[in-house]
């Protein structure tokens, strides 16, 4: 039975130019961590896992950069980043929990986090 | 069943290169990573690289960084060591082996080539 | 890097004995440590992961058991084909780490 739960950073904007920490934290659950993969849309950004360390996609690799922790970092953000992000964190033996963040880039500097919120 | 055949075995001349094949028969690269270990005559395990072909990016060991290459080519399912600079206790039999990406990588180093020996020696 | 030490390095055991090989890192890895066995002259295979599930195809006199920085392998009752080299591996933290060995002779 999986009991765990995500939480993410939720709903969050940054300016253009810019970059931006997507973070998911898994909970409430005694399951190994195998591996996180993060993605966009359908497009796998960055895989994780200690057998491998971190991997960037090549597509992405000069844009984007592990950590904090399992989290990732977007930099020279442009709004075509605007969209769904996924963290995806596939463990043993519940199975793979996701979490979803919403990434806004704006033009101006009315960039402003959101709140942090729960995926069950 | 996929099995990961290796290249033959190989005598070198210290301070020069080495490069090992591993070819998944029977499967692709698809939702894999391959690692690389090695075992030095009576020796243990040692851990030296891995690379994720989907990506074909690679992270090494410290101890073999700047002396060891890993890569993969997606087309013929084959992945390559190459160890330049090679001295006397770069003798050892090396070994590739298969690791779960996503849900299954818990399973760890499942399947592994039969190991290519390479010997350094003047 | 974690370190795993593995004890004893060796050992000799008569066919039909109860065989433990412990394993202990030098940091908690909670239960992100696999077992292979290795026999002269062929590659390592998987036996146990996550500290105590058994691979398929592996025959259930062998167990594994810990978790934190203490694991144990267990063989219930040693048979001819079980004499052979058991290493221990964590892939808890980047980069995975073996321990030294465990060579399990005929007494």
């Known amino acids: 039975m999986m009991t765990g739960t995500i939480e993410t950073t939720g709903n969050i904007s940054a300016e253009k130019g810019g970059s931006i920490i997507l973070q998911c934290h898994l909970s409430s659950t005694t399951a190994q961590v195998t591996q996180v993969n993060w993605e966009q849309q359908d497009q796998l950004l960055a895989i994780c896992n200690a057998d491998l360390g971190w991997h960037i996609s090549p597509s992405f690799k000069d844009r984007v950069a592990p950590g904090p922790g399992l989290g990732l970092t977007l930099q020279s953000l442009t709004v075509n980043d605007t969209g769904e992000y996924f963290c995806i964190y596939h463990t043993y033996p519940d199975g793979t929990y996701t979490g979803r963040i919403f990434l806004e880039v704006l033009e101006s500097s009315v960039a402003e986090h959101g709140a942090r919120f729960q995926i069950p | 069943q996929v099995q990961l055949v290796q290249s033959g075995a190989e005598v070198k001349k210290p301070g020069s290169s080495v490069k090992v094949s591993c070819k998944a028969s029977?499967?692709?690269?698809?939702?894999?990573?391959i690692s690389w270990v090695r075992q030095a005559p009576g020796q243990g395990l040692e851990w030296m690289g891995v690379i994720v072909p989907i990506f074909g990016t690679a992270n090494y060991a410290q101890k073999f960084q700047g002396r060891v290459t890993v890569t993969a080519d997606e087309s013929t399912s084959t992945a390559y060591m190459e160890l330049s600079s090679l001295r006397s206790e770069d003798t050892a039999v090396y070994y590739c082996?298969?690791?779960?990406?996503?849900?299954?990588?818990?399973?760890?180093?499942?399947?592994w080539g039969q190991g290519t020996t390479v010997t350094v020696s003047s | 890097d974690i370190q795993m030490t593995q004890s004893p390095s060796s050992l000799s055991a008569s066919v039909g004995d109860r065989v433990t090989i412990t394993c202990r890192a030098s940091q908690s890895i909670s239960s992100y440590l696999n077992w292979y066995q290795q026999k002269p002259g062929k590659a390592p295979k998987l036996l146990i992961y996550?500290?105590?599930s058994l691979q398929s195809g592996v025959p259930s006199r062998f167990s594994g058991s810990g978790s934190g920085t203490d694991f144990t392998l267990t063989i219930s009752s040693l048979q001819p084909e079980d004499f052979a080299t058991y290493y221990c591996?964590?892939?808890?933290?980047?980069?995975?780490?073996f321990g030294g060995g465990t060579k399990v002779e005929i007494k």
């Open positions: 029977g499967g692709t690269f698809q939702n894999y990573a």
């Open positions: 082996a298969r690791l779960h990406l996503g849900q299954k990588a818990y399973y760890g180093m499942d399947v």
């Open positions: 591996q964590q892939r808890y933290v980047f980069p995975p780490t």
């Open positions: 996550a500290a105590s």
